[in-house]
Interface confidence: medium
């Protein structure tokens, strides 16, 4: 599962700044449906001491709540540990710091293991350009195209952005 995604080069600091969620995928569809635990949207990211800090937007009762999470570095350069609805092994699958980022998480919660992938972009007007890449990474990790949800503006808490 991890074999194709190796050794990021360059600094994590390049990932800092604003991002927009474009698509989600999971082998457990409930996780990314409205009200699902992983139906969350990236707002911004920063890096410090090799760890990734993210501000995410979580839809709550018609509003969007901003929550800060930290993914902690591990001995593997593209792998991070994240505690969110259980334990997550978070992998940076493919990154162009100026354009797009594809990550996936192996989530373990109450003895249940799930796979969730997330595509985010810097510029929403270019989101179509990165969907093929997301589809191909998803297929590599065992997620099918019909398990991908492409988000609309209404979905991704656009109104909650500063």
């Amino acid at each position: 599962q991890e074999g194709n995604h190796e050794e990021p080069q360059g600094g994590l600091e390049e990932l800092s700044g604003r991002w927009h969620s474009v698509a989600l995928a999971s082998n457990k569809s409930d996780l990314i449906k409205p009200w699902g635990h992983f139906r969350v949207f990236i707002h911004s990211m920063s890096a410090k001491d090799g760890n990734l800090h993210g501000d995410i937007l979580i839809p709550q009762d018609g509003q969007c709540e901003k929550v800060s999470l930290t993914a902690f570095k591990t001995a593997t350069s593209n792998k991070f540990d994240l505690e969110y609805w259980g334990h997550n092994d978070l992998y940076l699958a493919e990154v162009d710091p100026k354009s797009y980022l594809i990550l996936y998480m192996i989530n373990q919660y109450n003895d249940d293991t799930s796979l969730v992938a997330h595509l985010m972009v810097r510029d929403l007007s270019r989101q179509q350009d990165f969907l093929p890449a997301f589809e191909s990474v998803c297929e590599d990790i065992g997620l099918h195209k019909d398990q991908i949800v492409v988000l609309s503006d209404d979905d991704r808490c656009q109104g909650s952005r500063d």
Epitope: N4, G10, E94, D96, S136, E139, D140
Partner: nanobody
Framework: QVQLVESGGGLVQPGESLRLSCAAS????????MGWYRQAPGEQREHVAT???????GYADSVKGRFTIYRDNAKNTVYLQMNSLKPEDTAVYSC??????????????WGQGTQVTVSS
């Protein structure tokens, strides 16, 4: 750095087929994903299709069901089989390769491009 050489472009009539090839040489061990972009005159570049080293594929909506991308790792070549071609498929098609994650635009390798013209 990876060197890419494309072939297979040409002039065809609507409804016909073409197969583009892109052969990679150089630091091919580092390739994670390969694919094709296209650009028509006066238009933005469009990501047409992509395939990972693990065989995962992705397509632009405009070509789904008509184009197929596949990769022959033994020959270090990626192919784009284009069926049911339409005049709007007319463009210069460029092959690209990106290294194993993390991919960075500055590290993309590009071919020189091959012209595909669909006209009656």
């Amino acid at each position: 750095q990876v060197q890419l050489v494309e072939s297979g472009g040409g002039l065809v009539q609507p409804g016909e087929s073409l197969r583009l090839s892109c052969a990679a040489s150089g630091s091919i061990f580092s390739i994670y994903r390969m694919g094709w972009y296209r650009q028509a005159p006066g238009e933005q570049r469009e990501h047409v299709a992509t395939v990972t080293s693990g065989g995962g594929t992705g397509y632009a909506d405009s070509v789904k069901g008509r184009f197929t991308i596949y990769r022959d790792n033994a020959k270090n070549t990626v192919y784009l089989q284009m069926n049911s071609l339409k005049p709007e498929d007319t463009a210069v098609y460029s092959c690209y390769a990106i290294p194993k994650s993390w991919s960075r635009t500055s590290e993309y390798s590009w071919g020189q491009g091959t012209q595909v013209t669909v006209s009656s």
